[in-house]
Structures are given as C-alpha cells and as structure tokens.
Amino acid sequence: SAGAGSHCQKTSLRVNFEDIGWDSWIIAPKEYEAYECKGGCFFPLADDVTPTKHAIVQTLVHLKFPTKVGKACCVPTKLSPISVLYKDDMGVPTLKYHYEGMSVAECGCR
Amino acid sequence: SAGAGSHCQKTSLRVNFEDIGWDSWIIAPKEYEAYECKGGCFFPLADDVTPTKHAIVQTLVHLKFPTKVGKACCVPTKLSPISVLYKDDMGVPTLKYHYEGMSVAECGCR
C-alpha cells in the first residue's frame, strides 16, 4: 500500500456500506471499490500527477520554507460513477444508474 | 493562520518569485498572493468545502478505521489567473494577462 514515503498514486479502498451507515438506504451493492489517493507530492512533481501551476509553486515554496508551507496534496482529480440500488421513502427499490463521484479514476497533486 | 486543528480554509501565501527561482523569467510582479488551502477535513464535512461523494465516503471510512484510511484533503478546488510580464525565448518582455491557475480562488475537501 502506498504510504507517505511513496509517490502519489491510486490505491485500493473497498468500502462496505454497512460500515458507513449507508446500508439503511443502499440495498446493493453491499460494498464497492472506492479507491484512495495515497502518497506524497514530492519535488519535482511528475507529469503523471498532473500538477496545476499552483501545486508547482506551492511545492517550490515548501522546498524553501518547509515549516511555513505544506506540500501539495494527493487527491482524486477524476471520479467515476457507480450504479446503486436504493430504497425510496416508501421502501421501494429504485436504480440510480449513474451515481456520480463515488470511485477514484485518477489521482493528482493539488 | 489555519493550522491542522482548524477547518479547511483559504489562507494567505505571499510568493516571491526570487524564492522559487522564477525571477529568471518573470519580470513582474516580484511577488503575488497565491493563497494556500489549510486545515482539516473533519466530520461532518460542511457544504462550504463542497465535498464530492467520494470525499464524504472517505471521511466516514476514516471515522470507522482512522489508522487504515486517511481523511479527505483540503486543496484548491478553483484557481484564478494572474497577469505576468515575462521574458520570452529571445528575452523580449511579454505580457500575459491570464497566466492560469496561479492563485487559489476556493478551497474544498477532496
């Protein structure tokens, strides 16, 4: 698994809806692959972490003043939807085919 | 200044181009307000940090398994341009009105 010493990357994160209390309204799936963005945004920022100009600037300032300014952060830069089956107010199962922003597609330094 | 104990917010970050070695090509300004996103993404995530569904999920998983999964991260979610006067390849001073992505407009939890 990618720790703080490794570079920013997408790692596995299986989420069980019961663990987060969403099983009260999500019928299926019981769990899904959410992924997590883990690792550091170290100088020099590689192209694969698609840094913004601000992230590059902040990284350079952090190099100069590490106690004053933090590093850029490894976060999801593109998310994917999943399909979920949920209970409506009347307990009727209904499908949301395109439930946005639930799974990480790409990570980057921001 | 917003520390790790405070909520995700935009804080001041004055960047001097000489400090980051960009004074070799940026003529003016000498420094600018880049801002920085600082603070934690704590449960419950407020609307003003515009959390994605993934950020909400990750926050809930972090609550349940704090050592296994990190919190969402406070990062720039919207950037603003600045105007810069820079030297082109031939050393000619050139004005770029919209040098994109240089300053934080908004912070959020991702």
Epitope: A28, P29, K30, Y32, E33, S80, P81, I82, S83, L85, D88, D89, M90, V92, P93, T94, L95, K96, Y97, H98 | -
Partner: antibody, heavy 114, light 110 residues
Amino acid sequence: EVQLVESGGGLVKPGGSLRLSCAASGFTFSNAWMSWVRQAPGKGLEWVGRIKSKTDSGTTDYAAPVEGRFTISRDDSKNTLYLQMNSLKTEDTAVYYCTTGTYWGQGTLVTVSS
Amino acid sequence: QSVLTQPPSASGTPGQRVTISCSVTNPDIDIFNVHWYQQLPGTAPKLLFFHEYRPSGVSDRFSGSKSGTSASLAIVGLQSEDEGYYYCAGLDEAMRGPVFGGGTKLTVLG
C-alpha cells in the same frame, strides 16, 4: 404496488413530433431517477435518456442518436414523466418503455412511417 | 455492435443448467456494474438481479457471477417458462447511462 403506465404512442410521419407520458404510482416518484428505454421491432433494448430527481439537480442525459431531438421532463406534482420527440425518423420506430431501472411500464408503440 | 457482447442464442432441456455470458469490450464500462434483465415473450423487461439483490418473485434458480471482463448468468433446473430474452446491462460512463447487451434468446427444448 408499483405501476408505470405509458401513453401517447401512435403513427407519425418522418419529421413529425410526438409526446409520450408515463404515469407513475406506488413509489416516491419525486425521488426517482427515471429513464426511457426503447425496443425496435425484433431488436434489443436501447437506452434513450434519463432525468434525475429535483433533489439531484434534475439534470437530463441522452443517448447520442436522440440528443437534440428528444427532451425528457417530469411533473412531480402529477407523478408523470414525459418524452417529447421531435424531428422523428423511421429508425425511431420502437416500443418505448419508462423505467426506474427496477420497474418497467408495459410500453407504448411509436411508428414513424410515411 | 454492442459494447456488451452476448451470444445471440442459448438452449437447454427442462431441468438442465444453462449459462449465458456477457463480455465487456469497452474500457468505459466497469464489469462491477453489470446486471441482468429478463424479457419473456410479449412482456416488458424485468430486473433479474443487481449485485446481491434479487427482486421478490425472481426464482433463486437464477444466479450471476463476474470474473475479469466477463459476467455470467446461470439458470439451474431449466423450465419452459424461462424461455425468452436475457439482457445484460452495464453503466457506460461516457454515455452517462445504461448500455444493454444485444440479448440472448433462450429456448427450452422438448
């Protein structure tokens, strides 16, 4: 009991327009994401488009073949879903179903022919 | 040509076990979201199951599995009333909605 009842199908000439309705009951219609799916004679299922609930912004998405010609709307006060079909083509001939993904109506036949 | 590929036909005798495959041929479609519909002659499609969820009224003779880029529907103890079309469906991220396989016509012989 969940019920979805489509109406408004019929024969129309190429270039013409038609509005389909889907009356819903037995579930919280205002919270549901509703889709239209069609089935050409002797063919498979084809997604037409979807409208999200108002609480999820009420946005619509459409399949490429109908984009710009078809419009999905909803009236939550009447528990009714609509499909406005303009500039109809012969290839739009199909049975049109409204669906929550879990529940489907019986379908209404649209025939586009000169 | 559908991005979810199914065999056009399948058959078996009463009591037999039949499987219908569904192969994903597009990177925009995650096998995770694939589910199945049944359409009996002259009727509307009906959800067979979605992940672990099986609607009331759907026989436990139907089961599904996923492996790699393929999903399978298995029917055990085949009965004459199972005759009809079976469609796999997935979430096409680019299309922002469901995409259906071409359908498999199941014939119960004898």
